[in-house]
């Protein structure tokens, strides 16, 4: 298969309000060169959740768990989840350029929020 895959293994994740949500994403290659970003929702109105290179994302931390040779971990954890955080989260690979262009997206992980 040509180039890389973006793998979001969890179709859905359910988290209690006030807890942290871990959103898993692995990528099979660094090539093409370019950043990974996380979004909630799709299309032009999507919301940027995390971009390592720039921006301030106080509730997001990176979670690198995979030591496998065949992929690299770009998972994140979002703390203090509220009902407003519900939605589908996408891990997106960009190709470096001026500007960077979207290359491939994961299938998405739907986050649902349970009452405490």
């Amino acid at each position: 298969e040509e180039e890389l895959q973006v793998i979001q293994p969890d179709k859905s994740v359910s988290v209690a309000a006030g807890e942290s949500a871990i959103l898993h994403c692995t990528v099979t290659s660094l090539i093409p060169v370019g950043p990974i970003q996380w979004f909630r929702g799709a299309g032009p109105a999507r919301e940027l959740i995390y971009n390592q290179k720039e921006g301030h994302f106080p509730r997001v931390t990176t979670v690198s768990e995979s030591t496998k040779r065949e992929n690299m971990d770009f998972s994140i954890s979002i703390s203090n989840i509220t009902p407003a955080d519900a939605g589908t989260y996408y891990c997106v690979k960009f190709r470096k350029g001026s500007p960077d262009t979207e290359f491939k997206s994961g299938a998405g992980t739907e986050l649902s929020v349970r009452a405490k």
Epitope: E1, E2, E3, T28, S29, L30, I31, P32, V33, G34, P35, I36, Q52, T62, V63, S64, T67, R69, E70, N71, M72, D73, F74, S75, I76, R95, K96
Partner: antibody, heavy 118, light 112 residues
Framework: EVQLVESGGGLVKPGGSLRLSCAAS????????MSWVRQTPGKGLEWVAT????????YYPSSVKGRFTLSRDNAKNSLYLQMNSLRAEDTAVYYC???????????WGQGTTVTVSS | DIVLTQSPASLAVSLGERATISCRAS??????????MHWYQQKPGQPPKLLIY???NLESGVPDRFSGSGSRTDFTLTINPLQAEDVATYYC??????????FGGGTKVEIK
């Protein structure tokens, strides 16, 4: 067993051209990112070029960009480096290297020597 | 460019003792908590051989006396205990998403 065998090195005058080849076996070549890395006694190891598994994307450092062209033929399990406008500072041992993820250089060939001299 | 500075340039260690090599990057090589720093061993007349990938992962077939640690800008390769066959030059290499990818200048390990 993974094998990478480089060929095509030799003595060339400044301004001349050479084409290096790397024949791969023992792994699924079309799934791997491939690169060339060179080594000189003075400058140590230097990354020279990288190509994506399908051949769509290529990357070069500024020291060779515009002079070197990397290509691959997945049907022949082969990697090629076309080197033009060669300079004395291109003199080095050139290694072919494979990478499953485009991250580390997992396997290396034995190298082929390029000498640029008048 | 990200500059990798290895220290020391050469190291003499007694058999059975610990050898420690440092690699410092001019800027972080971490992406999402993963450090894109790798270590290679090169013996005279041979190509480099991958030992450690992504800072701390031991390549298949490499003896567990080799270990790697560190994050962001500071990394260490440790050989413990040092064996005679470990005499070689060791290189660090970064492959973050900022081109060009670069190598350290190498550390030559010898037996004291």
């Amino acid at each position: 067993e993974v094998q990478l065998v480089e060929s095509g090195g030799g003595l060339v005058k400044p301004g001349g051209s050479l084409r290096l080849s790397c024949a791969a076996s023992g792994f699924t070549f079309s799934s791997y990112v491939m690169s060339w890395v060179r080594q000189t006694p003075g400058k140590g190891l230097e990354w020279v070029a990288t190509i994506s598994s399908g051949g769509t994307y290529t990357y070069y450092p500024s020291s060779v960009k515009g002079r070197f062209t990397l290509s691959r033929d997945n049907a022949k399990n082969s990697l090629y480096l076309q080197m033009n406008s060669l300079r004395a500072e291109d003199t080095a041992v050139y290694y072919c290297a494979s990478s499953l993820t485009g991250s580390s250089f997992d396997y290396w060939g034995q190298g082929t020597t390029v000498t640029v001299s008048s | 460019d990200i500059v990798l500075t290895q220290s020391p340039a050469s190291l003499a260690v007694s058999l059975g003792e610990r050898a420690t090599i440092s690699c410092r990057a001019s800027e972080s090589v971490d992406l999402y908590g993963t450090s894109f720093m790798h270590w290679y061993q090169q013996k005279p007349g041979q190509p480099p051989k991958l030992l450690i990938y992504r800072a701390s992962n031991l390549e298949s077939g490499v003896p567990d006396r080799f270990s790697g640690s560190g994050s962001r800008t500071d990394f260490t390769l440790t050989i413990n205990p040092l064996q005679a066959e470990d005499v070689a030059t060791y290189y660090c290499h970064q492959s973050s998403d900022e081109l060009p990818w670069t190598f350290g200048g190498g550390t030559k390990v010898e037996i004291k």
